[in-house]
């Protein structure tokens, strides 16, 4: 190889060992008869050399630095050439560095040809290995503006006082153009301006200077976004830190087209604007930091640009002004992310404050809109607290647990509507009465409706799940001892059509000691499957539950247990079951930890099944499944 550098080129070439590899044989640069591991070639010099090995790219790297002095004479503006041409250089990983020094009053603009640049953060790399590292200067301090790959949106970077630009090309890359040009501009009066141009839908992740280290103190950095008129942009902060300010406040400022309050000033912890039409600017302003404990200011953010959907132009009013203790959250459904560009899915408050999730609280009217390619990517979860603090006032009081019609007007699916029902301890209990009798969901007879009610204890220390219930069964009411949550969970969009079938009434009733009582009136046409709460995890220790099973006058009920034995092993106490005829009060007691469960048995009259648990040994829990069938009395049952 021969490298001869023109003396006025201000180019220096350095060939040196790259990152050490575990290659057995060393490799040398051979110049005449000498072997060396480092070679520096300065302007006006001419060097002939070879390598002592077959694959020098595994050992050496080459750096080509060009110093461009804009202080003492005119600046060589225009397209930047790769000099020496890559065809004249040995095939090593190569880094071209351009170091431009200019007066503070001169703005320098780097212009990148298509396919533009994409900024990447720590720990990332470029697919083709081609990277641009761009630094600026504040007095004598070098400031890293960022590291970039090809195929992005960054079209121009404006700086002043100087630029250091490094283009890294892997040895196998055929590229022979720099891909950028330099132009002079008037002073930009800030650290830098990064222009990001979107041609269509897409996203860009950008970072403050020096990221992930701290942004220079009291500096200003601006990003200019060029957005096609028919698209919308949303900003979200992926990661940020605030420093300790002595004077002024760290903030971001937006110049948004059509805004009457430009610049719009936001704290970094605020929700950032979304659903913006047209070009906009975002600026990061640092502060005077505490000298003793400066901390660091840093910001990594994403701009997402996408088509507004039909829904984006609609404003939905969610009137929670008459509601109490209610919160409505619209959020993304959990889905596996694909690797390709996924348009954002945002919900916007007052059309501007957009985020991936939004919680609305009671007491106000809220105006919301959506910026989302597919609203099935979102769902809605509502929580409402109904509490009684004074037992004398609440007793016998009833509340309807019904999804408000306002919610059906929203274009997103309801996932959960949870009512937290809170009662004064040991004073009141609750009864749930459905508009339509309920079926308990079991493996043997699963619910196939578009929604279910999930009933669980709402006492933090108690892990008690009564079960999942859907309309179309035999359970007339559920009585529970204390605080519970009732969650209406939807399973299909057809819930909107079936909404009329929903409806539970909750009433506060005098306190009783059992954890739960289910009132069951079996249907003559089908089996009623019933199972103990906390199925698969076992009925909690020392818990008691009952089923009040009504038998119509002309029917006989057959009670059948799923297993011969419960399998429960008691650590302390006894687990037992009482089956009691309601008319005669005759009862049978079964020891669940010792006895076999009774064989199928017939009841001519209504009866109780009561199960009381001991403190079971771990892994030997009490789970019980049974079913009831009715047959007409005329049939000979013997």
């Amino acid at each position: 190889f021969e490298i001869a550098l023109p003396r006025e080129s201000n180019i220096t070439v350095l060939i040196k060992l790259g990152t050490p590899t575990l290659l057995a044989k060393p490799c040398y640069i051979v110049i005449s008869k000498r072997h060396t591991t480092m070679l520096s070639i300065k302007p006006g010099e001419r060097i002939l050399f070879t390598f002592s090995c077959q694959s020098p790219e595994n050992h050496f790297v080459i750096e080509i630095q060009k110093n461009i002095d804009c202080m003492s004479g005119p600046c060589p503006f225009g397209e930047v050439q790769l000099q020496p041409s890559t065809s004249l250089l040995p095939t090593l990983n190569r880094t071209f560095i351009w170091d431009v020094k200019a007066h503070k009053s001169i703005g320098l603009e780097l212009q990148f040809s298509i396919p533009r640049l994409r900024q990447f953060g720590p720990g990332e790399s470029c697919p083709d290995g081609v990277t641009y590292s761009i630094s600026g200067r504040i007095d004598a301090t070098v400031v890293r503006i960022g590291t970039f790959c090809s195929n992005g949106t960054v079209s121009r970077i404006k700086m002043q006082e100087g630029v250091k630009m490094a283009l890294h090309l892997p040895w196998f890359h055929p590229r022979n153009v720099s891909g950028f040009s330099i132009a002079n501009r008037s002073s930009i009066k800030r650290l830098c301006i990064i222009e990001s141009v979107f041609e269509g839908e897409g996203s860009a992740t950008l970072m403050s200077a020096n990221y992930p280290e701290g942004f220079p103190e009291d500096e200003l950095m601006t990003w200019q976004f060029v957005i096609p008129a028919h698209l919308r942009a949303s900003v979200s902060f992926l990661n940020f830190n605030l420093s300790n300010c002595e004077r002024k406040e760290e903030r971001v400022e937006y110049y948004i087209p059509g805004s009457t309050t430009n610049p719009e000033v936001f704290k970094l912890e605020d929700k950032q604007p979304g659903n913006m039409a047209g070009n906009f600017n975002l600026s990061l302003q640092g502060c005077d930091q505490d000298a003793q404990n400066p901390g660091i200011l840093r910001l990594q953010f994403q701009v997402l640009v996408q088509h507004p959907q039909n829904e984006s132009n609609k404003i939905y009013v969610v009137d929670l002004s008459n509601e109490r203790a209610t919160s409505l959250t619209i959020e993304p459904r959990p889905v596996k992310q694909s690797r390709k560009f996924v348009p954002g899915c945002f919900v916007c408050l007052e059309s501007r404050t957009c985020s991936t999730n939004l919680t609305l609280t009671s007491g106000s009217k809220h105006k919301i809109s959506f910026l989302c390619d597919n609203l099935t990517r979102l769902w809605m979860n509502v929580e409402k607290n109904i509490s009684c603090t004074d037992h004398r006032y609440c007793q016998r009081k009833s509340y309807s647990l019904q999804v408000p019609s306002d919610i059906f007007h929203l274009p997103v699916e309801l996932h959960d509507f949870s009512w937290k029902l809170l009662v004064p301890k040991d004073r009141l209990s609750l009864v749930l009465v459905p508009a339509q009798k309920l079926q308990q969901h079991t493996h043997e007879k699963p619910c196939n409706t578009s929604f279910s009610y999930l009933v669980a204890s709402a006492i933090p220390s108690q892990d008690l799940y009564f079960g999942s219930f859907c309309p179309g069964g035999s359970i007339e009411q559920i009585q529970v001892k204390q605080n519970i949550s009732v969650t209406l969970r939807t399973f299909a969009p057809s819930f909107r059509q079936e909404a009329s079938r929903q409806g539970l009434t909750v009433s506060f009733i005098p306190y009783f000691k059992e954890e739960g009582v289910f009132t069951v009136t079996p249907d003559t046409k089908s089996k009623v499957y019933l199972r103990t709460p906390n199925w698969d995890r076992g009925l909690p220790s020392l818990t008691s539950v009952s089923w009040n099973i009504s038998v119509p006058r002309d029917q006989v009920a057959c009670l059948t247990f799923f297993k011969e034995r419960t399998g429960v092993v008691c650590q302390t106490g006894r687990a037992f079951m009482i089956i009691q005829e309601q008319r005669t009060r005759a009862e049978e007691i079964f020891s669940l930890d010792e006895d076999a469960l009774p064989k199928p048995r017939f009841h001519h009259h209504s009866f109780w099944v009561n199960i009381s648990n001991c403190s079971p040994a771990s892994g030997k829990q009490l789970d019980l499944l049974f079913w009831v069938t009715l047959t007409p009395r005329t049939v000979d049952l013997t």
């Epitope: 640069i29 110049i31 300065k42 006006g44 010099e45 060097i47 002939l48």
Partner: antibody
């Protein structure tokens, strides 16, 4: 045997032009950098210009920049020096010299020289 | 530009005696490759210059071994172990490190 033979020298008036040639033989001309070096009567040697193998890069001593142009024709194994706006101080014997095939700018072969006299 | 300074400018020598010429550069000629880019030429009367020494100490082909070059950085020496009458002429040092290529003023060797 390597040979370099200069021609084209002569008497020229100040401000005038002259074109020197150097015919190369005995080596692969297109593989070597070539130079012009001059020597004023009774004085030392002064490097004037050089040209890369393919003619893509050229360099000149400051005193001749913008007035002299070095060029080559690899097909004809020839090196040229086009001199214009000649001055009295350009009077010298002009040698063409080959850069040896190793690092640096060492001249391993020189021509016999051609005299250029600038005088009115 | 790198300035080359030779001394002495004139050197009368008796045949068979050694001779030594010094050359100093305004900047180090020692390259990162480990080579000193300094050459010595002899221009015999009425002839064109001929290369004696390149890279500070390497003799050019056909050059008698009584000629040797030494030195590094900025100070270099050409030695002739036993001067012969055919060695008469002007000796030039030249920096071959970078353009513009520059020569010393020359040292005239003459027989006493």
């Amino acid at each position: 045997e390597v040979q370099l033979v200069e021609s084209g020298g002569g008497l020229v008036q100040p401000g005038g032009s002259l074109r020197l040639s150097c015919a190369a033989s005995g080596f692969t001309f297109s593989r070597y950098w070539m130079n012009w070096v001059r020597q004023a009567p009774g004085k030392g040697l002064e490097w004037v210009a050089n040209i890369k193998q393919d003619g893509s890069e050229k360099d000149y001593v400051d005193s001749v920049k913008g007035r002299f142009t070095i060029s080559r024709d690899n097909a004809k194994n020839s090196l040229f020096l086009q001199m214009s706006s000649l001055r009295a101080e350009d009077t010298a014997v002009y040698y063409c010299a080959r850069v040896m095939y190793s690092s640096g700018w060492s001249f391993d072969y020189w021509g016999q020289g051609t005299l250029v006299t600038v005088s009115s | 530009d790198i300035v080359m300074t030779q001394s002495p400018l004139s050197l009368p020598v008796t045949p068979g005696e050694p001779a030594s010429i010094s050359c100093r550069s305004s900047r180090s000629l020692l390259h990162s490759s480990g080579y000193n880019f300094l050459d010595w030429f002899l221009q015999k009367p009425g002839q064109s210059p001929q290369l004696l020494i390149f890279l500070g100490s390497d003799r050019a082909s056909g050059v008698p071994d009584r000629f040797s070059g030494s030195g590094s950085g900025t100070d270099f020496t050409l030695k002739i172990s036993r001067v012969e009458t055919e060695d008469v002429g002007v000796y030039y040092c030249m920096q071959a490190l970078q353009t513009p290529i520059t020569f010393g003023q020359g040292t005239r060797l003459e027989i006493k």
